[in-house]
Interface confidence: low
């Protein structure tokens, strides 16, 4: 028997520095977690103690904090090189700055293979990107070899900006021939490393013949055997065992997100490359694990540029940006309109001639808007200003919901109207009319939504049975502010870009902004 230790991360999302327990900015260092300096300590400790160790990342290192906004992926290459990662799979967010934003800072600088078997380049890009990422890589580990085959969510064109010269194929269809190729090369231990979410990870384990282990990402899935060490609730045991169609037991793992845990899986193979046993658990990277001093010093050096950036002007406003709770929790506010417009703009993806865009709607809880921005400071807007408006370090995500769920959400928005509660929704691509004289649960008298399958966008009545795409804060997707119906009834959920980054990019693009209150939210006569 031969034993392999797989260390794995996924969906780190730019958390290079340690964070608080909820993965937001670290406030009390004695209770902070994660970060690359702490990760390095644990990885080195395991490498010294065990003979056959692989350190793998399942994608979405990009996007999530000011680190990515400023360094645009150079920080990912630098610190992953420093930690000596063995391989990485491409995630959807690796394409957030386009293909160039992946090639230059990461693909050309990484000293480890970057993988995806189901992304095929065409046209002029094919020769430019050739060899910079691979479908698979055979890695020597001790006296043996291990094949790593990569995959990426085929939804990436809807979630990021890969351009028109990359084709995202069905994961299973694309993986099988690559695994078969590895088998012909006499590689009998194969890990599928990728970024398509836990459901697809399980399908890959079930369907792709020859895959021994699946290391996944994208769905931020937390698996754990025994009593979990922090706030995350396990979606299943670690590893999660799938019985493949040809009768093998295939371990599937994921390690939550944000670098809070280091996945730790021990696999025992027989001489024919069959998995005999698998066990392990994610390791919580809490303050009991010291930060490595050399990596920490490097982090501090890179940090200086971030502090300078946060006070630089991103753009100007020539109007007061009303983000006060007196406005945003009671009526349409122009800060809400600005944020929603930025959210839609960030999701412009022309992937189908029949649609002007794949999504037109935004909802945003008024309670998530924490500050106004005064235009009387020469109109200047900085990252620091936006951090006061959106201080929680959330993301703006893409969900699919039935019309009936949206109707419930808008009823919830005003079910206890007048108490300055955070659930009052700000909107984009939606016209809503409330009648507050009616009883709670029956106050939405008109709900029109902007069409997507149209060349000239116009507002049509919401259809209860139709499935709509909506951009909203991850807080709402997770049922926050009492929006349990969204969490319970959503049909799909893909995590998006950092909230501040979305708004700052939009302001930088527009240069001068002047959002108005324009009748997106109305109250019918006599009730308000």
């Amino acid at each position: 028997a031969w034993e392999l230790t797989i260390l794995h991360t996924n969906d780190v999302h730019s958390r290079l520095e340690q964070t608080s327990e909820d993965s937001s900015k670290c406030v009390n260092a004695s209770r902070c977690m994660g970060g690359v300096a702490r990760l390095f300590t644990k990885v080195q400790q395991i490498r010294r103690a065990e003979p056959n160790v692989l350190l793998l990342d399942a994608g979405d290192q990009y996007q999530g904090t000011i680190w990515f906004t400023v360094y645009k992926g150079a920080e990912v290459a630098h610190f992953m090189n420093a930690l000596r990662y063995d391989a990485m799979a491409l995630g959807n967010h690796e394409f957030d700055n386009g293909v160039e934003g992946l090639i230059e800072p990461l693909l050309k600088e990484a000293k480890f293979p970057i993988l995806s078997a189901n992304i095929k380049a065409k046209g002029p890009l094919a020769s430019q990107i050739s060899g910079l990422y691979l479908p698979y890589k055979v890695l020597p580990v001790g006296d043996e070899v291990v094949g790593i085959v990569g995959y990426t969510s085929k939804e990436t064109p809807f979630l990021s900006n890969p351009g028109t010269n990359l084709v995202f194929e069905d994961e299973i269809t694309a993986l099988q021939p690559e695994v078969d190729k590895l088998k012909t090369l006499n590689v009998n231990k194969i890990i599928a490393l990728g970024h398509s979410g836990f459901e697809m990870d399980k399908l890959i384990a079930q369907k792709v013949r020859g895959v021994d282990v699946v290391v996944g990402g994208h769905s931020n899935t937390f698996l754990y055997t025994g009593n979990p060490p922090s706030k995350e609730v396990p979606a299943g045991k670690y590893p999660f065992i799938v019985t493949s169609d040809d009768g093998r037991k295939v371990p599937v793992v994921q390690a939550y997100a944000f670098g809070k845990y280091l996945g730790y899986l021990k696999i025992e193979f027989d001489e024919r490359g069959n998995v005999i046993s698998s066990h392990g658990n994610p390791i919580l990277l809490n303050s009991s694990i010291p930060e490595d001093p050399s990596i920490k010093a490097d982090i501090n050096k890179w940090r200086i540029k971030l502090d300078n950036y946060s006070t630089q002007e991103l753009g100007k406003t020539i109007v007061y940006l009303d983000g006060s709770s007196q406005s945003c929790r009671f009526r349409e506010c122009n800060m809400g309109n600005l944020i929603c417009d930025a959210m839609i703009n960030n999701n412009l993806r022309h992937t189908d001639e029949m649609f002007w865009n794949h999504v037109s709607m935004c909802i945003l809880n008024g309670g998530g808007i924490r500050s106004p921005i005064d235009e009387r400071n020469n109109g200047t807007i900085t990252w620091e200003n936006l951090a006061a408006v959106l201080p929680f370090g959330g993301t703006f995500d893409l969900v699919q919901l039935k019309g009936s769920t949206l109707k419930k959400a808008f009823e919830h928005s005003v079910h206890r109207y007048g108490q300055s509660t955070g659930e009052f929704l700000q909107v984009g691509g939606i016209h809503v009319v409330y009648d507050l004289s009616r009883k709670p649960g029956d106050r939405v008298v008109k709900l029109d939504v902007l069409c997507t399958k149209c060349r000239v966008p116009s507002y049509d009545p919401l259809k209860m049975d139709e499935v709509y795409k909506v951009i909203l804060p991850n807080f709402l997707a997770n049922g926050g502010d009492g929006f349990q119906m969204i969490k319970d009834e959503l049909l799909r959920h893909d995590s998006g870009d950092q909230d501040i980054n979305v708004v700052s990019t939009y302001i930088s693009k527009m240069k001068v902004i002047y959002p108005a209150v324009e009748g997106r939210i109305k109250f019918s006569t006599g009730s308000h």
Partner: antibody, heavy 117, light 107 residues
Amino acid sequence: DVQLQESGPGLVKPSQSLSLTCSVTGYSITSRYYWNWIRQFPGNKLEWMGYMTYDGTNNYNPSLTNRISITRDTSKNQFFLKLNSVTAEDTATYFCARGGWDPFDYWGQGTTLTVSS
Amino acid sequence: DIQMTQSPAALSASVGETVTITCRASDNIYSYLAWYQQKQGKCPQLLVKNAKTLAEGVPSRFSGSGSGTQFSLRINSLQPDDFGTYYCQHYYGTPLTFGAGTKLELK
């Protein structure tokens, strides 16, 4: 119980397009599985035409790639077959079925199509 | 494409007899093989998946065997309801292909 039901025109003229609908009850086509079109020629030969996966990806038989399109309406839990430029060779019984990366465990009863002027 | 070759094309047998139908794949399909039974004017019905696992509700007189490229379907003690046409089909990759069928008739 899962049920599939095909519907379509029965007779189509050569060079025209064929459109068929498969209505699924008892299971959401967005939940899992692949949703297929299969046809059976008069001599009983079965041919897999293509599928649409639960999340909307298509895979077609290369012999039909330039003529076939499979789409869906998730709100009605239906998926559709469109076959362009039909000839007498497309005369067959058309079945919809659930499966693809699994065997076809549920089939519709089939709809007979004749291509004739 | 993977070709599926079924034999015999037709077979006559009596109630109570045992028959075997074979199917050969042009390439290794591991255990990704299904068997179907079809009656005149009806849709095919799944009998066996993964080469040897009986589908739900299929009587135990049916059994599948084989892996790689050679497969067989055996029916012990034929019953009147067993007459019809039998097809094998691989689902190793696309395009999915069927055998030409074996027509089992009452002698």
